[in-house]
């Protein structure tokens, strides 16, 4: 059973976590950010399911793409530049919140996203857990 | 850590088939659809095609239509080339790349030499 | 289909140099260009994507540019690993299709 203390350290890595996904949404979503209708277009997978630490297996799978599509944007008017640095940070979060121990095929659901809309789901998945912790 | 390894050298003779494997390992195989190019002696790059693993999709160069077949087993991460009615100009090292949009081609296998000679 | 035409086909430079390469798509396929390095005998490796941007581990010295039908890869400040052949690849459409590359030598 989860202790007290186990809990809360969960509790503060999903806030971590969902500090960096809303950095990342309001850089991109950033007016100075020229880069913002060609990343647009890239379709990100959403996961069919998401309600549990191990569904974070399906945002892992979609960092790389992502650290990609934000490398389109790094300049010197847009503030995310250490991309490399901020997906290596979210990748350890998850890794660790996710549990290595069962690896889950991730499901993901037919229609595809746009990076807004991928990382709205993923802070509302956070959102979600956290209120539960609470 | 990503990789593509392909299946061995081999050696056919005009008229006949290869089928040269692919196997990805290191990322969830059916997000990222994969490429083939191959490349003659001293001569440069040429796309033949690519497929989707999760819909299991293909789209094939004008050039290779009727005689390429792309095809893959998610069950164990691996697509698969099939060049039939080979001939002497088909020799060349055959290439998988991994490739998502605009993202281009990431990660490339290692590449597999296929000799025609009668 | 689109025909990507790469110039100059063959370029000899010293270490140090400032080298341009030009890849010209006869329609327009907005920034869906990349640039790839291959050695003898190896597989080749991608430099730039999106017209001008570096995955991860590329050396800085690297740099692309251009949109529409006119694009360029630089390579600031030639290193003795930098002598290889370089294609750019359109990724816009289907069929996908490679300049003919441009072999770099060392002068």
């Known amino acids: 059973a989860p202790t007290s203390s186990s809990t809360k350290k969960t509790q503060l890595q999903l806030e971590h976590l969902l500090l960096d996904l809303q950095m990342i949404l309001n850089g991109i979503n950033n007016y100075k950010n020229p880069k913002l209708t060609r990343m647009l277009t890239f379709k990100f997978y959403m996961p069919k399911k998401a309600t549990e630490l191990r569904h974070l297996q399906c945002l892992e799978e979609e960092l790389k793409p992502l650290e990609e599509v934000l490398n389109l944007a790094q300049s010197k008017s847009f503030h995310l530049r250490d991309t490399k640095d901020l997906i290596s940070n979210i990748n350890v979060i998850v890794l660790e919140l996710k549990g290595s121990e069962t690896t889950l095929m991730c499901e993901y659901a037919d229609e595809t996203a746009t990076i807004v809309e991928f990382l709205n789901r993923w802070i509302t998945f956070c959102q979600s857990i956290i209120s539960t912790l609470t | 850590q990503v990789q593509l390894v392909q299946s061995g050298a081999e050696v056919k003779k005009p008229g006949a088939s290869v089928k040269v494997s692919c196997k990805a390992s290191?990322?969830?195989?059916?997000?990222?659809?994969i490429n083939w190019v191959r490349q003659a002696t001293g001569q440069g790059l040429e796309w033949m095609g690519w497929?989707?693993?999760?819909?299991?999709?293909?789209g094939y160069a004008q050039k290779f239509q009727g005689r390429v077949t792309m095809t893959r087993n998610t069950s164990i991460n691996t697509a698969y080339m099939e060049l039939s009615s080979l001939r002497s100009e088909d020799t060349a090292v055959y290439y998988c790349?991994?490739?998502?949009?605009?993202?281009?081609?990431?990660?490339w296998g290692q590449g597999t030499l296929v000799t025609v000679s009668s | 289909d689109i025909q990507m035409t790469q110039s100059p086909s063959s370029l000899s430079a010293s270490v140090g140099d400032r080298v341009t390469i030009t890849c010209r798509a006869s329609q327009d396929i907005e920034h869906d260009l990349g640039w790839y390095q291959q050695k003898p005998g190896k597989a080749p490796k991608r430099l730039i994507y999106?017209?001008?941007t570096l995955p991860s581990g590329v050396p800085s010295r690297f740099s692309g540019s251009g949109s529409g039908t006119e694009f360029t890869l630089t390579i600031s400040s030639l290193q003795p690993e930098d002598f290889a052949t370089y294609y750019c690849l359109q990724h816009n459409s289907f069929p996908r299709s490679f300049g003919q590359g441009t072999q770099l030598e060392i002068k």
């Open positions: 290191g990322y969830t195989f059916t997000n990222y659809d």
């Open positions: 497929m989707n693993p999760n819909s299991g999709n293909t």
């Open positions: 790349a991994r490739g998502r949009q605009w993202l281009g081609f990431d990660y």
């Open positions: 999106a017209a001008s």
